[in-house]
């Protein structure tokens, strides 16, 4: 029997943000091709990214079918069809991914402050409810639709003239905070899922300050 230089994939890594989910692996192929398969614990294996020379595979379409399921993927290595490679029958080389539960593990994307409105000494700050690729009844669900009250937002706000930050929390997408009249404030928000053990927090949103476009002021 002959030999082949086919090598198994390694460093299989899930990269997932707001349920957009890509499996990455190494190495770059030389005289070989890959096929990815994905399954739930109780389901059948489904081939994706078939016969590819890429080292990443977008598995979003599969995981959004049920984001609370736990998924396993495996990457098969095959000798390319133009490679001289003959040996006795043998299963293709493959490597398993770590298990991945989207609901518990997808990273929370950087949130965006949609608007803020001042009325007297109160400011209403609204966080954009980001659309995900999770569908229900043919419509895409928002992050809030998917996570419900599991998702909270933390607001950091401070006077433009000072560095002392205050915080507020909400389990909706809106904050109503007290401010000093005549002062300009800056705002940043962070998405948080307190019940999680990993990937609990997003990165902070871009800072928005009063006196700029997104704001509105009423006496």
């Amino acid at each position: 029997s002959g030999t082949t230089n086919t090598v198994a994939a390694y460093n299989l890594t899930w990269k997932s943000t707001n349920f957009k989910t890509i499996l990455e692996w190494e190495p770059k192929p030389v005289n070989q091709v890959y096929t990815v398969q994905i399954s739930t614990k109780s389901g059948d294996w489904k081939s994706k990214c078939f016969y590819t020379t890429d080292t990443e595979c977008d598995l979003t379409d599969e995981i959004v079918k049920d984001v609370k399921q736990t998924y396993l993927a495996r990457v098969f290595s095959y000798p390319a069809g133009n490679v001289e490679s003959t040996g006795s029958a043998g299963e293709p080389l493959y490597e398993n991914s770590p298990e991945f539960t989207p609901y518990l593990e997808t990273n929370l994307g950087q949130p965006t402050i949609q608007s803020f409105e001042q009325v007297g000494t109160k400011v209403n700050v609204t966080v954009e409810d980001e659309r995900t690729l999770v569908r229900r009844n043919n419509t895409f669900l928002s992050l809030r639709d998917v996570f419900g009250k599991d998702l909270i937002y933390t607001l950091y706000y401070w006077k433009s003239s000072s560095s002392g930050k205050k915080t507020a929390k909400t389990n909706t997408n809106e904050f109503l905070i007290d401010v000093d009249k005549g002062e300009n404030y800056c705002f940043s928000v962070q998405a948080v899922i307190p019940s999680r053990t990993v990937n609990r927090k997003s990165t902070d949103s871009p800072v928005e300050c009063m006196g700029q476009e997104k704001g509105e002021f009423r006496e």
Epitope: K48, G87, A89, Y94
Partner: nanobody, 114 residues
Framework: QVQLVESGGGLVQPGGSLRLSCTAS????????MGWHRQAPGKGLELVAV???????HYADFVKGRFTISRDNAKNAVYLQMNFLRAEDTAVYYC????????WGQGTMVTVSS
């Protein structure tokens, strides 16, 4: 060693059809890729089409819309339906199964000529 036996080749006129069949001598795992490559006179081996155990397919650009690959896991067989054949499809067509290694049939000749 897995033995692959092809059949169905022959002489056909341009625009005609042929169906190639390939059967393995032993059970082929559903994790194997099966498919077809071809080698035209004086040219190198090139991929035609491949299929996974669960029916996912990949075609070379030059056959898309003309050729259809299918697989019967129970029969350890793979098929290639070739329609709208052209003179440039003339080649030896090799059945292929890939697991840990590549396995090849002996080839079947397809000649497209008027």
């Amino acid at each position: 060693q897995v033995q692959l036996v092809e059949s169905g080749g022959g002489l056909v006129q341009p625009g005609g059809s042929l169906r190639l069949s390939c059967t393995a001598s032993e059970t082929i795992s559903s994790t194997y890729i099966m498919g077809w490559h071809r080698q035209a006179p004086g040219k190198g081996l090139e991929l035609v089409a491949v299929i996974s155990g669960d029916g996912v397919t990949h075609y070379a650009d030059f056959v898309k819309g003309r050729f259809t690959i299918s697989r019967d896991n129970a029969k350890n067989a793979v098929y290639l339906q070739m329609n709208f054949l052209r003179a440039e499809d003339t080649a030896v067509y090799y059945c292929y199964a890939a697991g840990r290694w590549n396995h090849w049939g002996q080839g079947t000749m397809v000649t497209v000529s008027s």
